[in-house]
């Protein structure tokens, strides 16, 4: 289950700490790593495997790390500072407005336009039409005689927050 | 708007037990603990403790272990509290308040249900 | 448990007047990382309460600037710089620096 709050949702304005592995709050302030007790008094580390935080907090708890959907790779796994990274499995992508779910990817262009993007873990193959070079919609028509395409080798990893 | 609307009045035996709502809306119900306090008749508020609906802790008064339960419905951003072998020094009007998840930030309620009425009486 | 005193308990003002109310802590409310969790509320009749001030003169969002807060470690004043009818109700003062938190017993403002 994905988290549904990230640190970039909750993080208070961040201040420069100096660094340290436990102990306690700096200037108010629990390092990376850490959450602070229910006194204020302490820094307590997050569990490893389980939750994480990003920057110096004061958040009563660590966050959850997020678990990779099915249709999704574990590119990295989460640590005490840093949440799971997952990416769209191969063929499939994940829209920005709607980063709930991947979606497969289409398999070619409608006529009259021509491949000019890959498939990638977050965008579908792109199209422009062969004569004025514009972008098409992505709005799939409902007879579409294609261009077959083999997905596309992601540049670099999508890194998702929660 | 942010607004938390706590279940009706409710008049129990001594012994029983009593489960009040409060249900949230016009914010994010995850974003925030969910607080309860008391209010004995003509007496201050007392600090119940707190429910962390991201993540499902509880936090209490420990005066108040063993004599409230704290739960949330996350479909419904709804908080219950429930009260159990109750006595009739329960009977008082109980408040549901959010508070922020940061310490600096989290001792305070910001917006309060309109409260509920529990009288325990044989 | 950190007691919280208030003074007066009852307090009659006259509208367009000054209003001041004190609160007093068991144990200083400086936090160790240097900040003060001195909150105050209002409960107007029939009403639940409502906030005020936090951490110590911090006006929250919406409450006029008649109202304002200040004090130090034990002793804290919430002033009203000019009464209004609608100010009436019962002032707490509360605590976020110690765990658990608590209330005072509460000031009742009522029109002279």
């Known amino acids: 289950e994905s988290a549904l709050i990230t640190q970039q949702d909750l993080a208070p304005q961040q201040r420069a700490a100096p660094q340290q592995k436990r102990s306690s709050p700096s200037e108010g302030l629990c390092p990376p790593g850490h959450h602070i007790s229910e006194d204020g008094r302490d820094c307590i580390s997050c569990k490893y495997g389980q939750d994480y935080s990003t920057h110096w907090n004061d958040l009563l708890f660590c966050l959850r790390c997020t678990r990779c959907d099915s249709g999704e790779v574990e590119l990295s796994p989460c640590t005490t500072t840093r949440n799971t990274v997952c990416q769209c499995e191969e063929g499939t992508f994940r829209e920005e407005d709607s980063p709930e779910m991947c979606r497969k990817c289409r398999t070619g262009c409608p006529r009259g336009m021509v491949k000019v993007g890959d498939c990638t873990p977050w965008s579908d193959i792109e199209c422009v039409h062969k004569e004025s070079g514009t972008k098409h919609s992505g709005e799939v028509p409902a007879v579409e005689e294609t261009v077959t395409s083999s997905p596309g080798t992601p540049a670099s990893p999508c890194s998702l927050s929660g | 708007q942010v607004q938390l609307v706590q279940s009706g009045a409710e008049v129990k035996k001594p012994g029983a037990s009593v489960k009040v709502s409060c249900k949230a809306s016009?914010?994010?119900?995850?974003?925030?603990?969910m607080n309860w306090m008391k209010q004995s008749p003509g007496m201050s508020l007392e600090w119940i403790g707190r429910f962390n609906p991201y993540n499902g802790d509880t936090f209490y008064n420990q005066k108040f272990k063993g004599k409230a339960t704290l739960t949330v419905d996350k479909s419904t951003s709804t908080a219950y509290m429930e009260l159990s072998s109750l006595r009739s020094e329960d009977t008082a009007v109980y408040f549901c308040?959010?508070?922020?998840?940061?310490?600096?930030?989290?001792?305070?309620?910001?917006?309060w249900g309109q409260g509920t009425l529990v009288t325990v009486s044989s | 448990d950190i007691v919280m005193t208030q003074s007066p308990l009852s307090l009659p003002v006259t509208p367009g007047e000054p209003a001041s109310i004190s609160c007093r802590s068991s144990q200083s409310l400086v936090h160790s990382n240097g900040n003060t969790y001195l909150h105050w509320y209002l409960q107007k009749p029939g009403q639940s309460p409502q906030l005020l001030i936090y951490?110590?003169?911090n006006r929250f969002s919406g409450v006029p600037d008649r109202f304002s807060g200040s004090g130090s470690g034990t002793d804290f004043t919430l002033k009203i710089s000019r009464v209004e009818a609608e100010d009436v109700g019962v002032y707490y003062c509360?605590?976020?620096?110690?765990?658990?938190?608590?209330f005072g017993p509460g000031t009742k403002v009522e029109i002279k």
């Open positions: 016009g914010y994010s119900f995850i974003g925030y603990f």
């Open positions: 509360s605590q976020s620096t110690h765990v658990p938190w608590t």
């Open positions: 308040g959010r508070s922020a998840y940061y310490f600096d930030s989290g001792g305070y309620f910001d917006y």
């Open positions: 951490k110590v003169s």
